[in-house]
C-alpha cells in the first residue's frame, strides 16, 4: 500500500483550512480520550478511479468520498483519519486530515474527498473514515467502513494500468490446444515482442476429479526478433493413463518487467464425451 504523489495532497476547501499528514493509524485521541467527540461520517463512498503520476504512469486508486452530518458535533470535529486495510496481507495505511480552522455550518453539506491511495489489481480493501477525536471508551462509534474489491488485470480498464502492463497484461497468447493421436497434445500460442523464455505447464486430471494424474513442464527458449508475434507450436507427449483425460495447459512468460511473477494464461481440454454404454447382455441365459 502506498500513496500516489505524496507532495500533491490537499484537503483545504472554501471555509476550511486543512492539511494532510501521515498517520500511524493510532490517533492520539485513543490514548487521551476527549469528553466531546463528533458524530460519524455520512454516505461514505468508495470508487475505483485512475490517476497518472508525474512520470506519466497510470495507477488504480481508491476514491474516497464522504459528507458530514448536519449536527452541532461539527463544532468539535478536529479532522479525520482515513485508513485502507488490504485484507489478504493485513497491511494498513493511514492518513490524517488535520483541520487548522473550526468548521461552521454553511448553506450546503460539508463534503470531503481523497484519491491518493494506490490499490492493487484483484485485491480487496476495507476503507474506514474515522472522525477525530475518536470516541471515549463505550462511546458511540464515529467511523464508517466499506469493503471494496479491485478488478484484476483481465478487466478492460485495468489492463492498461502500469501495474497490469508490467505484469504482461497486454500479451494475448490466444492459446489453442488440440488432441492428437498417440497420446499427444499440440499447443499453439502467440509469442510476445520480447526476447524472453516461456514455460508450458501441463496438468492432467481424471474426468470428474481435481487431483492431478500427470504433470509435465516444457521450456521454450527466447524467440529471435523475427519470431515476435508469431505462433509457437509445441507437441507434448501425455502419459498413457486411462481416464487421465482432462488437460490444463498454462503458459508462463518471463518478461523483463515481471520476471517469474508475470500473468499466466491457460486453456483446458475436456475429456471426450463417453457414449452411454448399454448393459452387457449375458451370453447364456440361466434356466432357473
Amino acid at each position: 500500500l502506498r500513496l500516489l504523489d505524496h507532495r500533491a495532497l490537499v484537503c483545504s476547501q472554501p471555509g476550511l483550512n486543512c492539511t494532510v499528514k501521515n498517520s500511524t493509524c493510532l490517533d492520539d485521541s485513543w490514548i487521551h480520550p476527549r469528553n466531546l467527540t463528533p458524530s460519524s461520517p455520512k454516505d461514505l463512498q468508495i470508487q475505483l478511479h485512475f490517476a497518472h503520476t508525474q512520470q506519466g504512469d497510470l495507477f488504480p486508486v481508491a476514491h474516497i468520498e464522504w459528507t458530514l452530518q448536519t449536527d452541532a458535533s461539527i463544532l468539535y470535529l478536529e479532522g479525520a483519519e482515513l485508513s485502507v486495510l488490504q485484507l489478504n496481507t493485513n497491511e494498513r495505511l493511514c492518513v490524517r486530515f488535520e483541520f487548522l480552522s473550526k468548521l461552521r455550518h454553511h448553506h450546503r453539506r460539508w463534503r470531503f474527498t481523497f484519491s491518493h491511495f494506490v490499490v492493487d489489481p484483484d485485491q480487496e480493501y476495507e476503507v474506514t473514515v474515522h472522525h477525530l477525536p475518536k470516541p471515549i471508551p463505550d462511546g458511540d462509534p464515529n467511523h464508517q467502513s466499506k469493503n471494496f474489491l479491485v478488478p484484476d488485470c483481465e478487466h478492460a480498464r485495468m489492463k492498461v494500468t502500469t501495474p497490469c502492463m508490467s505484469s504482461g497484461s497486454l500479451w494475448d497468447p490466444n492459446i489453442t490446444v488440440e488432441t492428437l493421436e498417440a497420446h499427444q497434445l499440440r499447443v499453439s500460442f502467440t509469442l510476445w515482442n520480447e526476447s524472453t523464455h516461456y514455460q508450458i505447464l501441463l496438468t492432467s486430471f481424471p474426468h470428474m476429479e481435481n487431483h492431478s494424474c500427470f504433470e509435465h513442464m516444457h521450456h521454450i527458449p527466447a524467440p529471435r526478433p523475427e519470431e515476435f508475434h508469431q505462433r509457437s507450436n509445441v507437441t507434448l507427449t501425455l502419459r498413457n493413463l486411462k481416464g487421465c483425460c482432462r488437460h490444463q495447459v498454462q503458459i508462463q512468460p518471463f518478461f523483463s518487467s515481471c520476471l517469474n511473477d508475470c500473468l499466466r494464461h491457460s486453456a483446458t481440454v475436456s475429456c471426450p464425451e463417453m457414449p452411454d454404454t448399454p448393459e452387457p447382455i449375458p451370453d447364456y441365459m440361466p434356466l432357473w
Partner: nanobody, 127 residues
Framework: QVQLVESGGGLVRPGRSLRLSCTAS????????MHWVRQAPGKGLEWVSG????????DYADSVKGRFTISRDNANNSLYLQMNSLRSEDTALYYC????????????????????WGQGTMVTVSS
C-alpha cells in the same frame, strides 16, 4: 441510453423456484459489478446479492444465503438471480442495479454505490 430491464417475476408457491433475469444496454456491461435489491410491500429496500464484473466474487444477504444464486453472462449483457426454496417473506419487487464505479462494493452497505436501477419485477410467494 443506459437501461436495465428485469423479467422472470411472478406468483409461485412456497418451496418452489424462480429465475429472475436482467438485460442491460447502453453501457459496457462487463466493466461493472451488479447487484439485486428488493423491496417488500410497505417495507424499505433490502440488498439481496452482488456479483463482481467477471463473476469471480459473489455476496449474499444472510436472509437468502444458500437459497439464492447470482450469476451473469457478460456475452449477453445479462444478470440472473436463481431463487430456490422460496418463502413468503421473499415476496417483493426485485430490482437489478449497476454500480457507479468499476470496483465492487462488497456486502450490504452499498446503496450509495449504485447509480442505475431497473423498473423491477414482482415476485409473489403464496400458497
Amino acid at each position: 441510453q443506459v437501461q436495465l430491464v428485469e423479467s422472470g417475476g411472478g406468483l409461485v408457491r412456497p418451496g418452489r423456484s424462480l429465475r429472475l433475469s436482467c438485460t442491460a444496454s447502453g453501457f459496457t456491461f462487463d466493466d461493472y459489478a451488479m447487484h439485486w435489491v428488493r423491496q417488500a410491500p410497505g417495507k424499505g429496500l433490502e440488498w439481496v446479492s452482488g456479483i463482481s464484473w467477471n463473476g469471480g466474487a459473489m455476496d449474499y444477504a444472510d436472509s437468502v444465503k444458500g437459497r439464492f444464486t447470482i450469476s451473469r453472462d457478460n456475452a449477453n449483457n445479462s444478470l440472473y438471480l436463481q431463487m430456490n426454496s422460496l418463502r413468503s417473506e421473499d415476496t417483493a419487487l426485485y430490482y437489478c442495479i449497476k454500480e457507479k464505479s468499476l470496483g465492487y462494493c462488497r456486502g450490504g452497505s452499498c446503496s450509495d454505490a449504485f447509480d442505475i436501477w431497473g423498473q423491477g419485477t414482482m415476485v409473489t410467494v403464496s400458497s
